[in-house]
């Protein structure tokens, strides 16, 4: 009888062990463990009757196609073999074991007691069958084993072969290579590449097989198992393998497909091949006059650029524009994209105007193209370039006027300072209640009128100021304070004031500049009280243009101590005093108690303990402080009231040759206008110089050395 | 054309707050100032404060500073005056003024418990 | 703060004759910037608000009677009505503006 085993291990005996089995007895013994697993058997007793080869009593082991052993006796001789220690190892999972005794025994046998066992496969040590052992990588384990792959490799579906991922390779430049993968190691199994070139319409691809060729072939059947094949359009060439590479191939096509093919199996190297696009040739090309073509080849081909570019000082001229550079391509029948465009040489044209200044032409007729020279200069006396610029610009190549210092930037002209039209009287002696100026010997006087249209009626007033540049007025604080009901200090609004410069005779306003503020600034620190700090400034909303009858005064150095003591300066003022005046009659000036024409007077600066004295004497609170110095005489006089509110107190200074404002006419009094020992109270400007350049945004360096030339 | 009408009366408790309003047209409100002045029964007249428009600068009497605040909202043209911490003695009829020349018809305030 | 007092407190004058009204103030009105003194006078009836007949000491609003007329200086002005009319009974108040505005007391005028 057949007796049926599907454990992982157990035991077999002969039947009625220990005792004697009994005679003509069979017994099969099918002994089956899972896939992965091979059984190992051996004996813990063995006492079989003895026989030639066997053939009485016997335990034959076998698998279903081969007997493995046969064993009988007790002990191993030349014609019967006992199993002893002997292991006996199953190739797959199933053993089937098999007893049997024949009719008769001559003695007592006691028979045989087996155990069995399922042992582990190691599949990956095992397996010689390429077709069935992992390609790169085993993995063992109890009952199995699995394959893996390299990086870049994917496992086949046959979960042996690796093969890569290659079907979408795009190649788009005009020259390449293409190998296969991994290649100058074995390609991998079980795959399909696909390489596809495309380039441009009109380029045609060459490919060259290079160094190593070697793909798995047939010596009968022409590429059964790997191969290439190169597609061009409907027609297909190959396929290729072997060791001998394919010729060359001219495909006559932009747009090319190549197909590998791997099996399962074998170990090639592969192959690898570049690939080249050539296109039609061009006509020679010839360089423009003052030009050059880069770059500079014998011949070109289907998309070769050349940019043709000109010498220095010479631009490329195409179609009536002017470019730096000029590309030109070889199209794919052959011919050029464009002609040659010409060279011409760069023109800077006509440079720009210079506020100010003028232009002169230092080349012949007026050139205005490479390396022409042109000078730039001010409207003098009335500006002077800034840091004595020469002027001289060039046409450079780049077609922009260049000067060495300032670039591609114009000079600038800066308004001269303190030079009037007519030379102002500086030793002319006292001038008892003034005199008239003669148009021009106080370009800087500006009347400050202002018209607070938030009251009303509206408030008007007004004073003096001094032009500082040909946008700056300087002036008192007092004069462009809002008169607010308080004693807060806020500035008038910049809408309710108008500038008058070049004002001669208040009569006729025809020749004079009249300018809206744009800024009207007061110093920050202006005191109501005391008026200490009394200066201001108005920025116009406008530039006025310089002439004889318009122009800035100089700016003192910075000096705490002010004017010297007794130094002799001049103020001049329409000499508008009169408490019941309206500012309309002055701009219209249609009354008599005023003076028509703009007045002058010299004064002497009064020593500060003097005039500090004279002011301390008085009944009420005034302080002279280190920020006002005063002017006039002992003995007073009608002059000292002259000058209206926020008016320069000029001094000539000997060393730049310039008149300086170094006061502006801030306060006097509380006695009636030119009473004795009733000094005028100016502002000291050269404690302010820092702050005046500062609102005015230039540095002080930039006009500083007009004063101290 | 040019005037400056005020809100109507009020009858407020002592300690409450009260706002007159006051619309301007006819000019440029903006650029002028509007001044406020009370008048209480049978007194003369007190000046209050002032307020630009189209900066919103103000001027305070002292004896207001703490209680009044004027405001404006130029997009109605219309100025405003706010009496906080009402006494009995506030009782006035309160005017807003064109800087000197315009008067409002006035505004009674009544305080009274 | 500067203090504006009037006098008298009140004056009765006959119709056509002339009326005087007097306001000094504890400081000088005269602005030295603006050149302008900042005295303003007033009048005003029962029932409506002041109306303004006089500013910067001197100068008479436009579509007041030439009647009415201010002078003065410094710190002592005067209001004159030259010849009284009977629309002219009210209370008349001088305002300085030199500072934060204040009034004086007022003038009551009536007919005699």
């Known amino acids: 009888h057949t007796v049926e085993l599907n454990n992982m291990f157990g035991q077999i005996q002969s039947p009625g062990y220990p005792d004697s089995y009994p005679s003509d007895s069979e017994v099969t013994w099918n002994i089956t463990v899972p896939d992965g697993f091979r059984i190992k058997l051996y004996f813990m007793h063995f006492n079989l009757e003895s026989s030639y080869l066997c053939e009485y009593d016997y335990v034959k082991v076998e698998t279903e196609d081969q007997v493995l052993a046969t064993f009988c006796g007790r002990e191993t001789t030349d014609t019967e073999q006992t199993p002893g220690q002997e292991v006996v190892l199953s190739p797959g999972s199933f053993m089937s074991i098999t007893f049997r005794s024949d009719f008769s025994n001559e003695e007592r046998f006691t028979g045989f007691d087996a155990h069995y066992m399922a042992v582990d496969v190691d599949e990956c040590k095992e397996r010689e069958d390429e077709e069935l052992s992992c390609d790169h990588y085993c993995h063992n384990y109890i009952g199995g084993y699995y394959c893996s792959c390299r990086f870049g490799y994917i496992l086949h579906t046959d979960n042996r072969t690796c093969r890569v991922e290659c079907s979408d390779n795009l190649f788009t430049q005009r020259t390449g290579v293409i190998t296969s993968p991994d290649f100058p190691n074995p390609y991998p199994k079980s795959s399909e590449c696909l390489y596809t070139i495309e380039l441009e319409e009109g380029f045609m691809v060459n490919l060259q097989f290079e160094d190593i060729f070697d793909i798995e072939d047939h010596p009968e059947v022409p590429c059964p198992y790997d191969y290439i094949k190169i597609k061009v359009g409907p027609k297909v060439l190959g396929p290729f393998c072997g060791e001998k590479a394919p010729e060359p191939i001219s495909t006559q096509s932009h747009s090319v497909l190549i197909l590998f093919h791997s099996d399962n199996s074998g170990e090639n190297r592969g192959w690898r091949l570049s690939y080249r696009a050539a296109g039609n040739e061009c006509p020679e090309l010839q360089p423009p006059v003052h030009g050059k073509i880069e770059p500079s080849q014998a011949k070109y081909f289907f998309k070769d650029q050349v940019l043709v570019s000109c010498d220095t000082g010479y631009k490329v001229l195409k179609d009536n524009v002017e470019m730096d550079t000029f590309q030109i391509e070889c199209l794919k029948d052959g011919t050029w994209s464009n002609k040659i465009p010409t060279c011409k040489i760069v023109d800077c044209r006509a440079p720009g105007e210079l506020e100010h200044g003028l232009i002169t032409f230092s080349t012949r007729n007026n050139l205005t193209t490479y390396k022409s020279e042109i000078k730039y200069s001010c409207q003098e006396p009335y500006y002077k370039m800034l840091n004595n610029n020469t002027g001289i610009y060039t046409c450079s190549a780049q077609g922009v006027w260049m000067n060495k210092v300032l670039g591609r930037s114009l000079p600038t002209c800066l308004p001269e300072c303190g030079q009037p039209s007519r030379s102002l009287p500086s030793l002319v002696k006292r001038i008892i209640g003034g005199r008239n100026a003669e148009p021009g010997l106080f370009p800087w006087q500006a009347l400050i009128v202002v018209e607070d249209t938030s009251r009303v009626p509206n408030d008007k007033w007004f004073g003096s100021g001094a032009l500082l540049s040909a946008s700056w007025i300087l002036t008192a604080a007092h004069v462009l304070r809002s008169q607010r009901r308080d004693t807060t200090v806020i500035p008038v609004s910049k809408e309710h004031v108008t500038v008058y410069l070049g004002l001669h005779d208040v009569r006729d306003k025809s020749g004079a500049v009249n300018s809206s503020a744009a800024r009207v600034v007061l110093h920050p620190d202006f005191n109501i009280q005391n008026y200490n700090h009394d200066i201001a400034l108005v920025q116009l909303q406008e530039p006025v243009p310089l002439g004889p009858h318009v122009m800035p005064v100089c700016l003192p150095r910075l000096e705490p101590e002010g004017p010297a003591p007794h130094m002799l300066g001049l103020v001049a003022g329409w000499g508008i005093s009169n408490p019941n005046v309206t500012v309309d009659e002055i701009i219209s000036s249609g009354t008599r108690t005023l003076s028509d024409v703009l007045q002058y007077v010299k004064l002497p600066v009064v020593p500060h303990a003097e005039c500090k004295t004279s002011y301390e004497s008085r009944s009420g609170n005034y302080s002279v402080t280190e920020n006002m110095f005063c002017a006039g005489y002992y003995e007073g006089g009608k002059d000292t009231c002259l000058g209206d509110s926020g008016g320069a107190f000029v001094i000539f200074d000997d060393l730049s040759q310039r008149w300086v404002v170094q006061g502006l006419v801030s306060w006097g009094g509380p006695e009636e206008c030119g009473s004795k020992q009733v000094y005028g109270v100016y502002t000291k400007v050269s404690n302010y110089v820092d702050w005046v350049w500062e609102q005015m945004g230039l540095p002080q360096s930039v006009v500083e050395p007009q004063v101290e030339r | 054309q040019v005037q400056l009408v005020q809100s109507g009366a009020e009858v407020k408790k002592p300690g409450a707050s009260v706002k007159v309003s006051c619309k301007a047209s006819?000019?440029?409100?903006?650029?002028?100032?509007i001044e406020w002045v009370r008048q209480a029964p049978g007194q003369g007249l007190e000046w209050m404060g002032e307020?630009?428009?189209?900066?919103?600068?103000?001027d305070y009497n002292e004896r207001f500073k703490d209680r009044a605040t004027f405001t404006a909202d130029t997009s109605t043209s219309t100025a405003y005056m706010e009496l906080s911490s009402l006494r009995s003695e506030d009782t006035a009829v309160y005017y807003c003024?064109?800087?000197?020349?315009?008067w409002g018809q006035g505004t009674l305030v009544t305080v009274s418990s | 703060d500067i203090v504006m007092t009037q006098s008298p407190d009140s004056l009765a004058v006959s119709l056509g004759e002339r009326a005087t009204i007097n306001c000094k103030s504890s400081q000088s009105l005269l602005n030295s910037v603006t050149r302008k003194t900042y005295l303003a006078w007033y009048q005003q009836k029962p029932g409506q608000p002041p109306k303004l007949l006089i500013y910067?000491?001197?100068t008479r609003e436009s579509g007041v009677p030439d009647r009415f007329s201010g002078s003065g200086s410094g710190t002592d002005f005067t209001l004159t009505i030259s010849s009284l009319q009977a629309e002219d009974v009210a209370v008349y108040y001088c305002k300085q503006s030199y500072t934060l505005p204040t009034f004086g007391g007022g003038t009551k005028v009536e007919i005699k």
């Open positions: 003024v064109r800087s000197e020349d315009l």
């Open positions: 910067w000491a001197s």
């Open positions: 307020i630009l428009p189209g900066s919103g600068s103000t």
């Open positions: 006819g000019y440029t409100f903006t650029g002028k100032w």
